[in-house]
């Protein structure tokens, strides 16, 4: 965990000082240093550092929480409050946002940004594609065309003088339209199915 707080073990102790002298403060444990010729080391409780565990650590200043997690130093413990989509003591685990998140009615789960969303099949909407979409809600038929919901989408019944899937093309007085080429058998005023 190179991104986290440095090792809480203190530095090698002063020469001539042994563990019997009680050099480790704040609950630190003295390791080694049985005699004046061998150096001791202090293992410091979380929240303290220094050769004798004499320094209080501002552990949050080292930004131990990954992926935008919020750091909380509780004194005896460090907590990371993770953003959605991340977990672990240091928010180090990127959750599979789509795991166990089925999108209904043929929708496809799309991961990203620590969250998931569903790309819904035509005719469905909502967070999990469970809602039947009203394709006419957005008033897709232009120039006063009337919208009809259809199992495969919507159908526009165009007002006189307009044509096209969304009634977007005016019909000229001579019978020509702004369409590049109308499909054969399609007359102005016929319902235009939008697929």
């Amino acid at each position: 965990y190179p991104y986290d707080v440095p090792d809480y073990a203190g530095m090698l102790g002063s020469s001539g000082v042994t563990c019997a002298d009680g050099p480790c403060f704040n609950g630190g444990l003295c390791v080694g240093g049985a005699d004046p010729d061998s150096a001791y080391i202090c293992h410091c409780p979380p929240g303290f550092q220094g050769s004798n565990c004499e320094k209080r650590v501002d552990r949050c200043s080292l930004q131990p929480c990954r992926n935008g997690g919020l750091c909380l130093d509780l004194g005896h413990a460090l907590r990371c409050r993770c953003r959605a989509g991340f977990a672990g003591p240091r928010c180090e685990h990127d959750l599979d946002d789509c795991a166990g998140r089925a999108c209904a009615n043929g929708g496809t789960c799309v991961e990203g940004g620590g969250a998931h969303r569903c790309s819904c099949a035509l005719g469905f909407g909502g967070r999990d594609c469970r809602e039947r979409a009203d394709p006419c809600a957005a008033r897709p038929c232009a120039h006063g065309g009337r919208c009809y919901a259809h199992f495969s989408g919507l159908v526009c019944a165009c007002a006189p003088g307009y044509m096209g899937a969304r009634c977007e093309f005016p019909v000229h007085p001579d019978g020509a339209s702004a369409l590049p080429a109308a499909p054969p058998g399609l007359r102005p005023g016929d319902p235009q199915r939008y697929l």
Epitope: C19, C24, G27, L29, C30, G32, H43, H76
Partner: antibody, heavy 118, light 108 residues
């Protein structure tokens, strides 16, 4: 309140390696040192080793050559391995959390009995 | 290593009486880094006292600890039925961490 649960085989053959795992019930594994302690039947307590997630470890010199302690933060677990076991290693093995102020033990697992027999 | 010797090995008392348990170290326990534990049969030890005299969370005030250097004492002012158990001292000033051999407090 955090809870600790030891797991591993209750029976080990002489000369084999004993492997035990302790599962921590919450995400506090990075906040504390974690330790193993054992107690032979009818006898006192013996500290084995401790570990901190940064990599700091410390072992009882009487067991150091045979003991390995490790930690897996992703699983909220730490483990003990004791090699070349003999009948003298039969004991209740406890995992414990090291107190936040000094190396006493404030939370203990319920213990798991390990028998050494062929 | 620091060797801790507990005495007496067994203490026979009645409920309501005062219990005094001793823990003596082979060398000075630095910074009064000494703890006491209670263990009932078939259960894990429970931390009672740390820093020689500080009660752990949830420990009744009938338990008290004292001492420094090499001599430490655990006192139970009035024994309750649930206090009959084995008590261990532990030093955590110098590695290796060591425990005493225990004192059994039994009903007389």
């Amino acid at each position: 309140q955090v809870q600790l649960q030891e797991s591993g085989p209750g029976l080990v053959k002489p000369s084999e390696t004993l492997s035990l795992t302790c599962t921590v019930s919450d995400n506090s594994i990075s906040n504390y040192y974690w330790s193993w302690i054992r107690q032979p039947p009818g006898k006192g307590l013996e500290w084995i080793a401790y570990i901190y997630y940064s990599g700091t470890t410390n072992y009882n010199p009487s067991l150091k050559s045979r003991v390995t302690i490790s930690l897996d933060t992703s699983k909220n677990q730490f483990s003990l391995q004791l090699s070349s076991v003999t009948a003298a290693d039969a004991a209740v093995y406890y995992c414990a959390r090291v107190f936040h102020w000094g190396f006493a033990f404030d939370i203990w697992g319920q213990g798991t009995m390990v028998t050494v027999s062929s | 290593e620091i060797v801790l010797t507990q005495s007496p090995g067994t203490l026979s008392l009645s409920p309501g009486e005062r219990a005094t348990l001793s823990c003596r170290a082979s060398q000075r326990v630095s910074n009064t880094y000494l703890a006491w534990y209670q263990q009932n049969p078939g259960q894990a030890p429970r931390l009672l006292i740390y820093g020689a005299s500080s009660r752990a969370t949830g420990i009744p005030d009938r338990f008290s600890g004292s001492g420094s250097g090499t001599d430490f004492t655990l006192t139970i002012s009035r024994l309750e039925p649930e206090d009959f158990a084995v008590y261990y001292c532990q030093q955590y000033g110098t590695s290796p961490l060591t425990f005493g051999g225990g004192t059994k407090v039994e009903i007389k």
